[in-house]
């Protein structure tokens, strides 16, 4: 039975040209995390595997940095980065947990008003 829950930052905004940290946290389970996938709806961004370490999708190599922890840092943000992001936790023995984050990339002046949604 899957007892765990994924906590995410929910909806966040960031400034065009800046960077943002995507973070999820799996709680309420003793299951072992074997792999975390970071994905958009139709694109794998990165994988953090317990044995293999981090693997960044080659097409995102220049704009994605691993961490902190199991999180993911997106850099040089563009308006096209606006959208849904998913953290997919592969665990044993529970199975797969999926968390959702919505990122809105804003022009500089607008983003300042949304700063409270950014992860510190």
């Amino acid at each position: 039975m899957m007892t765990g829950t994924i906590e995410t930052t929910g909806n966040i905004s960031a400034e065009k040209g800046g960077s943002i940290i995507l973070q999820c946290h799996l709680s309420s389970t003793t299951a072992q995390v074997t792999q975390v996938n970071w994905e958009q709806q139709d694109q794998l961004l990165a994988i953090c595997n317990a044995d293999l370490g981090w693997h960044i999708s080659p097409s995102f190599k220049d704009r994605v940095a691993p961490g902190p922890g199991l999180g993911l840092t997106l850099q040089s943000l563009t308006v096209n980065d606006t959208g849904e992001y998913f953290c997919i936790y592969h665990t044993y023995p529970d199975g797969t947990y999926t968390g959702r984050i919505f990122l809105e990339v804003l022009e500089s002046s607008v983003a300042e008003h949304g700063a409270r949604f950014q992860i510190p």
Partner: antibody, heavy 121, light 113 residues
């Protein structure tokens, strides 16, 4: 173009070890995971394990832990698999295969031609 | 480990006829959060390594003829060749692309009747 070059055959004696190579070209070696797959007529295709050439991290199928050791040499863009304490059960074709990112998926997109290992006294 | 079971083991189909290969996984390969199925199909001809045909259960690899199609979700999947050609004679494998260890079906040998 992407190529994975493997030696065609290895003949080894029971109890010995063999280290086979997989030389990659046509892409950035450290940006892609490299996997090894065993094929026998009886058991079909079996995933042995994978190596991340960038970090050196390895993941093994529990069945092949202690049998296979995966390494990679970044300077020559070559992945290696060593098989130890060989028996007739290890006679098989061994493939190296790269995983590429296809949308949300990590897929075996390029394969070596395979190395045929024959264990015989 | 996820066990992949293919049926039939072998199949003989007349040229121009439809060929259907089934694959069943012991655990769901669907991530319901993003509605993606982590299943791939490969074709292997004698003396060659496997070649990718389908990924994500239904997406054809670039260059694969449109007579090949994949369908299914969760634990039950199907590879269909709508009109068999002579060059389609091969062994076909499904593969769990969901979690390590990656596992393959036992293969289906497709021949011409």
């Amino acid at each position: 173009q992407v190529q994975l070059q493997q030696p065609g055959a290895e003949l080894v004696k029971p109890g010995a070890s063999v280290k086979m190579s997989c030389k990659a070209s046509g892409y950035a070696f450290t940006n892609y995971l490299m996997h090894w797959v065993k094929q026998t007529p009886g058991r079909g295709l079996e995933w042995i394990g994978a190596i991340n050439p960038g970090s050196g991290g390895t993941s093994y199928n529990q069945k092949f832990k202690g049998k296979a050791t995966l390494t990679a040499d970044k300077s020559s863009s070559t992945a290696y698999m060593q098989l130890s304490s060989l028996t007739s059960e290890d006679s098989a074709v061994y493939y190296c295969a790269r995983t590429g990112v296809y949308g949300n998926f990590l897929i075996f997109d390029y394969w070596g031609a395979g190395t045929t290992v024959t264990v015989s006294a | 480990d996820i066990v992949m079971t293919q049926s039939p083991d072998s199949l003989a189909v007349s040229l121009g006829e439809r060929a259907t290969i089934n694959c069943k996984s012991s655990q769901s390969l669907l991530n319901s959060g993003i509605q993606k199925n982590y299943l791939a199909w490969y074709q292997q001809k004698p003396g060659q390594p496997p070649k990718l045909l389908i990924y994500g259960a239904s997406t054809r690899e670039s260059g694969v003829p449109d007579r090949f199609s994949g369908s299914g979700s969760g634990t039950d999947f199907t590879l269909t060749i709508s009109s068999l050609q002579a060059e389609d004679v091969a062994v076909y494998y499904c593969q769990n692309d969901h979690r390590y260890p990656f596992t393959f079906g036992g293969g289906t040998k497709l021949e011409i009747k």
